[in-house]
């Protein structure tokens, strides 16, 4: 029961995170002007994976594509990557997650089958949520560069009286979805993998029973049988689980790099 | 088609209060925001500040904060501007305008006179 | 705040003649964002409000004649009348869109000679 729980919780809860993980690609709000010194602009802009908008005063938002491929930053190219290497790989996990949980009886599929098909979903899970809190760090260092080099040369003089205030950009409501999502497809990830062992039948040994007519003493034949999970012993699985929990801490601790935002 | 009305001319004496409506019509109110420009006898055009129905938000010019209080009412599509301790300094033609896409004000009221004489 | 300075303060055009009006900002009023200029030209006859010409420095307000049009980028700026028509007496504003507070320029008034 608690297996099933933990499956499905965690197949919810990647649901969930993969699902801000592509709002957050689609969303405009990756960056957005900063106006903490300029408040007094009547126009606004704010700029996403895809495209770039600007909002005036009056309500209206004109956004235009990014026309051109070989134009953009490499680092942007790379952010995008990373968020559609994500999706993808979370939308594979929520597939073969569907088909593994337990609550859901396809044919006559063995646990074993099924534990395997979890493990691989929660592993899905956790590189997914890995590229997403990848991404949007790249992105939002990328950010934090740019922002304080603007700093530096914060008016751009045209000379005499003339003076432009040069555009600076800090962090959109993107990166805070991509951040809360790439963390909850991992937690789910972890989840499944977690869910996994308890699906993993366990090593049982049958007592083959052997009569024979002649009246000797029984023979007793242990390990006649060995469950076979299709992954090895217990022992390399536990490795993977522990390998799991390890990344998950890299992951946790990989945001701290940014705290100086 | 899109309408600003606003309310007839006004005498006051100083230390006085006056309330300008500005009621729109031919549009959705909330979507866009009422500009106040004002324009003293035989002066140019002043920005006084803008109300968003729709956000709530309020912006006033340097010199319009204090006495000058920008007020809607969504329910009537009317837009106010309420100003206090009158002086004679605020005699003048108070118009309203949308802003519209472009940040341009597209549609004025007909202004309103407001003197103030003792 | 946003200086917009007018030129010339009045102006004397023979009936179908070309009338040019001068602005100057203090600032660029040119947004990276999307490359328009957030200056808007607005006509005013005695005893009426305002009415709106051109906005982002160079569209024309629908209804507008053609003879009116606007140019200019950054901090300088130009409407020009090309043909003077009766009905274009007026006094004429150049107004900035760009930062608050809204600023209007000075005024030209346009009369015919």
């Known amino acids: 029961m608690a297996v099933t729980a933990c499956q499905g919780l965690g197949f919810v809860v990647s649901l969930i995170g993969i699902a801000g993980i592509i709002a957050a690609t689609c969303m405009d709000q990756w960056s957005t002007q900063d106006l903490y010194n300029n408040p007094v602009t009547a126009v606004f802009n704010y700029q996403g994976l895809w495209r770039s908008c600007v909002r005036e005063s009056s309500g209206f938002t004109e956004c235009r594509g990014y026309f051109t491929l070989l134009g953009l930053p490499a680092m942007l190219q790379a952010v995008r990557a990373l968020m559609i290497v994500g999706i993808v790989l979370g939308a594979i996990g929520l597939l073969v997650s569907i088909f593994a949980l337990k609550c859901i009886r396809i044919g006559s599929m063995e646990d074993s089958a099924k534990a395997n098909m979890t493990l691989t979903s929660g592993i899905m899970f956790i590189v997914s949520g890995l590229c997403a809190i990848a991404g949007v760090s790249v992105f939002a260092n990328m950010l934090v560069t740019n922002f304080w080099m603007s700093t530096a040369n914060m008016y751009t003089g045209m000379g005499g009286m003339v003076q432009t205030v040069q555009t600076r950009y800090t962090f959109g409501a993107a990166l805070f979805v991509g951040w809360v999502a790439g963390g909850l497809t991992l937690i789910g990830g972890v989840m499944m993998c977690i869910a996994c062992r308890g699906l993993a039948p366990e090593e049982t040994n049958y007592k083959a029973v052997s009569y024979h007519a002649s009246g000797h003493s029984v023979a007793y034949k242990p390990g006649g049988f060995k469950a076979s999970t299709g992954f090895g012993s217990n022992t390399k699985n536990k490795k993977i689980y522990d390998g799991g929990a390890r990344t998950e801490d890299e992951v946790q601790s990989y945001p701290s790099k940014h705290d100086y935002v | 088609q899109i309408q600003l009305v606003q309310s007839g001319s006004e005498l006051k004496k100083p230390g006085a209060s006056v309330k300008v409506s500005c009621k729109a019509s031919?549009?959705?109110?909330?979507?866009?925001?009422i500009n106040w420009v004002r324009q003293a006898p035989g002066q140019g055009l002043e920005w006084m500040g803008w109300?968003?129905?729709?956000?709530?938000?309020?912006t006033y010019a340097e010199g319009f904060t204090g006495r000058f209080v920008l007020s809607w009412d969504t329910s009537v599509s009317t837009a106010y501007l309420q100003i206090s301790s009158l002086k004679a300094e605020d005699t003048a033609v108070y118009f309203c305008?949308?802003?519209?896409?472009?940040?341009?004000?597209?549609?004025w009221g007909q202004g309103t006179l407001v003197t103030v004489s003792s | 705040d946003i200086v917009m300075t007018q030129s010339p303060d009045s102006l004397a055009v023979s009936l179908g003649e070309r009338a040019t009006i001068n602005c100057k900002s203090s600032?660029?009023?040119?947004?990276?964002?999307?490359?328009?200029?957030?200056l808007a030209w607005y006509q005013q006859k005695p005893g009426q409000p305002p009415k709106l010409l051109i906005y982002?420095?160079?569209t024309r307000e629908s209804g507008v004649p053609d003879r009116f049009s606007g140019s200019g980028s950054g901090t300088d700026f130009t409407l020009t009348i090309s043909s003077l028509q009766a009905e274009d007496v007026a006094v004429y504003y150049c107004?900035?869109?760009?930062?608050?507070?809204?600023?209007f320029g000075g005024g030209t008034k346009v009369e015919i000679k």
């Open positions: 031919g549009y959705t109110f909330t979507n866009y925001g």
């Open positions: 107004q900035q869109a760009y930062y608050y507070p809204l600023t």
């Open positions: 600032q660029s009023l040119l947004y990276s964002g999307n490359q328009r200029n957030y």
């Open positions: 305008a949308r802003l519209y896409y472009g940040n341009r004000f597209d549609s």
């Open positions: 982002w420095a160079s």
């Open positions: 109300i968003n129905p729709g956000t709530g938000e309020t």
